[in-house]
Amino acid sequence: MRRGPRSLRGRDAPAPTPCVPAECFDLLARHCVACGLLRTPRPKPAGASSPAPRTALQPQE
């Protein structure tokens, strides 16, 4: 289960949001929810343009 990069962190460093891969962090509800509830970008066919580049950390953001 991917929970984001792990590293040694300073005491004041931000912690990653621990959402499982099928979930995204709801910034307003302040907890993880199904990504489909948040209008996160749908996967597109290869070659299709997307509205904004998405990183591998998508569910955590």
Partner: antibody, heavy 118, light 113 residues
Framework: DVQLQESGPSLVKPSQTLSLTCSVT????????WNWIRKFPGNKLEYMGY???????YYNPSLKSRISITRDTSKNQFYLQLLSVTTEDTATYYC????????????WGAGTLVTVSS | DIVMTQTPLSLPVSLGDQASISCRSS???????????LHWYLQKPGQSPKLLIY???NRFSGVPDRFSGSGSGTDFTLKISRVEAEDLGVYFC??????????FGSGTKLEIK
Amino acid sequence: DVQLQESGPSLVKPSQTLSLTCSVTGDSITSGYWNWIRKFPGNKLEYMGYISYSGSTYYNPSLKSRISITRDTSKNQFYLQLLSVTTEDTATYYCAGLDGLYWYFDVWGAGTLVTVSS
Amino acid sequence: DIVMTQTPLSLPVSLGDQASISCRSSQSLVHSNGNTYLHWYLQKPGQSPKLLIYKVSNRFSGVPDRFSGSGSGTDFTLKISRVEAEDLGVYFCSQSTHVPPFTFGSGTKLEIK
């Protein structure tokens, strides 16, 4: 493509209720956060509130208890009501959808100018 | 609420010039998840606002590379390297870190000198 369109009266009398509809096509309002934002003459943008995928709402405290946002999922529309309007509520009203990954307003209606005047 | 202070309010430029708009927030916009949710919008005359830059420095799809965003914490800048006629309008910064409510800068009107 997701498209939003505001509709409602362009002229409202002081003390009356401003009522606007936002019609959404290309996406379901049972997903995401759906918002009302207004722009005053002179360019100030004010965030008014949202209705969420679950139907929960948030209202900007600056609007006190004058505001209500509701929805009709069968029509894929959400609504703004602003009670007891004054001339200070004259503005262009926008509905907008929120990107749920980077949290910007990714889709906006064209806006509707509402003038409060007797 | 987070106050977003934008300067200048009006920015007269000549076509081809560089333009720079500043946005300062009343608190750090670094979220506890490490992201900085500072965005820039452009509202052209007669249109609704459109996203230009998201998360400080990422250009939205279709936005020309003459637009760039930078900054961190509480101080952010939008630069247009060579202003074109189609760039005229009102630019707004906005924060989505400490929400709700979402808050906007007061707007900078880019106009021809």
